[in-house]
């Protein structure tokens, strides 16, 4: 029964798998982009690498009504230890510096690929 229970509940996803899935989702977004992503919405830029997942989520959470990034928002929330809601402003953001969502997603993909290569999964 113990063994069967293990099959029934797969347990938490390893961080390396979660990061790879997030990277794959960002690749999908960047490759399948035809019209301007999220109608060219702008998000806060980020100026540090530490605490990046929460900061990235805080930027993207302010983009509403954009189905293309909803999965990314959900996935990022799994990496961020605290609850993030729209309107939050992290010290990691560059004040008064906004960039297009499409560029932000592309930059996030670059950064996550580096983390994956370096084995930094959390």
């Amino acid at each position: 029964l113990t063994c069967l229970g293990g099959f029934a509940s797969p347990g938490p996803v390893p961080p390396s798998t979660a990061l790879r899935e997030l990277i794959e989702e960002l690749v999908n977004i960047t490759q399948n982009q035809k019209a301007p992503l999220c109608n060219g919405s702008m998000v806060w830029s980020i100026n540090l690498t530490a605490g990046m997942y929460c900061a990235a989520l805080e930027s993207l959470i302010n983009v509403s009504g954009c189905s293309a990034i909803e999965k990314t928002q959900r996935m990022l929330s799994g990496f961020c230890p605290h609850k993030v809601s729209a309107g939050q402003f992290s010290s990691l953001h560059v004040r008064d510096t906004k960039i297009e969502v499409a560029q932000f997603v592309k930059d996030l993909l670059l950064h996550l690929k580096k983390l994956f290569r370096e084995g930094q999964f959390n």
Epitope: S45, N47, I99, Q103, D107, L108, K114
Partner: nanobody, 118 residues
Framework: GVQLLESGGGLVQPGGSLRLSCAAS????????MGWARQAPGKGLEWVSI????????YYADSVKGRFTISRDNSKNTLYLQMNSLRAEDTAVYYC???????????WGQGTLVTVSS
């Protein structure tokens, strides 16, 4: 869109110093390895120095080692190149650029001219 704007070039005497700056906008500067490249009159493009995204590692061409120092301020989205003990052969247009292995992430500035002459 993405912009890289160099400044600080000019005319300087041999043995003199200059500090180049590159103001970045339109992308997440803190996540990119960055560098300075140069092109001397009638010559090809040469990488001078590269700095990793966090600033933790730096690389220099042999021709500038010990004379040039690359640095960055991610809070200001700015890249710097401190050039000391300048020589006539350092005369070139200096370009600020992203330095990622994947050319999908390739961005370049317009360049700033450095002339070393007496």
């Amino acid at each position: 869109g993405v912009q890289l704007l160099e400044s600080g070039g000019g005319l300087v005497q041999p043995g003199g110093s200059l500090r180049l700056s590159c103001a970045a906008s339109g992308f997440t500067f803190a996540w990119y390895d960055m560098g300075w490249a140069r092109q001397a009159p009638g010559k090809g493009l040469e990488w001078v120095s590269i700095i990793t995204d966090t600033g933790g590692r730096t690389y220099y061409a042999d021709s500038v080692k010990g004379r040039f120092t690359i640095s960055r301020d991610n809070s200001k989205n700015t890249l710097y190149l401190q050039m000391n003990s300048l020589r006539a052969e350092d005369t070139a247009v200096y370009y600020c650029a992203t330095a990622e292995r994947d050319d999908t992430f390739d961005y370049w500035g317009q360049g700033t001219l450095v002339t070393v002459s007496s």
